[in-house]
Interface confidence: low
């Protein structure tokens, strides 16, 4: 389980129309459910319920975004429509270039993602928890444009981190 180095860049627009960018660094883990690869894309927050779909047909969306999913306590969804691995697959099928799970409230999901699969996803599936997850969700919940860059080694240049 290698460390995933995640840089999140938040774009704040000013009244003049210019953008100010804030970069936050955090760490997670690459799970065995996916590949240990670098990936980058605009963050799209996905609710775990939103990864359910009763249609057999798969919608294919524009490719290249990073899905962020905050997993709920298992009691809140007693009979989930998909396993955590299934949710990761669904997000990738829909065009996610990577999936980041916040497992703070559902730590059992770590084992599910690391059970290993005969057919792992070809995109990274990362999990974060604790202070790193709080940092990430604070940015995501701002509902502003943000990009995530996932790397499997630390960024070459020291990043200036802003606490969000």
């Amino acid at each position: 389980k290698e460390t995933a180095f995640v840089e999140v860049v938040l774009f704040e627009s000013s009244p003049s129309g210019d953008y100010t960018t804030y970069t936050t660094g955090l760490t997670g883990r690459f799970s065995r459910a996916g590949a240990t690869l670098s990936a980058e894309g605009e963050i799209v927050q996905m609710h775990p319920l939103g990864l359910c779909n009763n249609n057999d047909e798969e919608d294919l969306y524009e490719y290249g975004w990073v899905g962020v999913v905050k997993l709920e306590q298992p009691e809140l969804d007693p009979k989930p429509c998909l396993t955590v691995l299934g949710k990761a697959k669904r997000a990738v099928q829909r065009g996610a270039t990577a999936v980041i799970f916040d497992v703070s409230e559902n730590p059992e999901a770590i084992d599910q993602l690391n059970q290993g699969s005969e057919d792992p996803l070809k995109r990274p599936v990362v999990y974060v928890k604790g202070a790193d997850a709080i940092k990430l969700m604070n940015i995501v919940n701002k509902q502003k444009v943000a990009r995530a860059r996932i790397q499997h080694r630390p960024p070459r240049q020291p990043t200036e981190y802003f606490d969000m």
Partner: antibody
Framework: EVHLVESGGGLVQPGGSLKLSCAAS????????MAWVRQAPTRGLEWVAS????????YYRDSVKGRLTISRNNAENTQYLQIDSLRSEDTATYYC??????????????WGQGTLVTVSS | DTVLTQSPALTVSPGDKITISCRAS??????IHWYQQKSGQQPKLLIY???NLDSGVPDRFSGSGFGTDFTLTIDPVEASDTATYFC?????????FGGGTKLELK
């Protein structure tokens, strides 16, 4: 802040056509499923059509298939509803809605103010 | 289609704790969502996924249920809660709405 503004409603004769528009702002339009929901006093709220974020998939309730066409223009942040062969039972307030969450339409997260369509001779 | 049944009306006093029920004709897992519609306005999302409060909704509102029986609770009720409340399911296609429960205050 999310804003959805419908236009195009009005009084139409039975058999006529109408095209409703919905201008969206305040969010990344191309990330979300969009829908039209109508409300008639006699029938309550009724989902009529929805469209996937890229516009490649459209869904309709059975009773309107063939007469209604939902479409979107992501470059202009606008969705449309073309209604043909209008019937009296199409009389309703038509709401534009952004579904939630992103990339999967489960609930109607935001609603426009509605546009009234009246079918009468 | 999945039919959602709601009791049509409820009259209560400010400060009361009230529950509005929604019964589905077939199982819908936790995929019930609740909306509030005030007179002359568009509906507004209150709760999604049976129990998740939408952002900006007061925590006087709560939801519960699984399968076929769901409840929206308001505790305590305020005068501004006068409205019609609708449930909606997204587990089965097509997505359907309940007929609404009109809440009036004494």
């Amino acid at each position: 802040e999310v804003h959805l503004v419908e236009s195009g409603g009005g009084l139409v004769q039975p058999g006529g056509s109408l095209k409703l528009s919905c201008a969206a702002s305040g969010f990344t339009f191309s990330n979300y499923d969009m829908a039209w929901v109508r409300q008639a006093p006699t029938r309550g709220l009724e989902w009529v059509a929805s469209i996937s974020p890229g516009g490649g998939k459209t869904y309709y309730r059975d009773s309107v298939k063939g007469r209604l066409t939902i479409s979107r223009n992501n470059a202009e942040n606008t969705q449309y509803l073309q209604i043909d062969s209008l019937r009296s039972e199409d009389t309703a307030t038509y709401y534009c809605s952004r579904l939630g969450p992103a990339y999967s339409g489960e609930w109607f997260a935001y609603w426009g103010q509605g546009t009234l369509v009246t079918v009468s001779s | 289609d999945t039919v959602l049944t709601q009791s049509p009306a409820l009259t209560v006093s400010p400060g009361d704790k009230i529950t509005i029920s929604c019964r589905a004709s077939e199982g819908v897992n936790t995929r019930i969502h609740w909306y509030q519609q005030k007179s002359g306005q568009q509906p507004k999302l209150l709760i999604y996924g049976a129990s998740n409060l939408d952002s900006g909704v007061p925590d006087r509102f709560s939801g519960s249920g699984f399968g076929t029986d769901f409840t929206l609770t308001i505790d305590p009720v305020e005068a501004s809660d006068t409205a019609t409340y609708f449930c909606q399911q997204s587990w089965n296609v097509p997505h359907t709405f309940g007929g609404g429960t009109k809440l009036e205050l004494k």
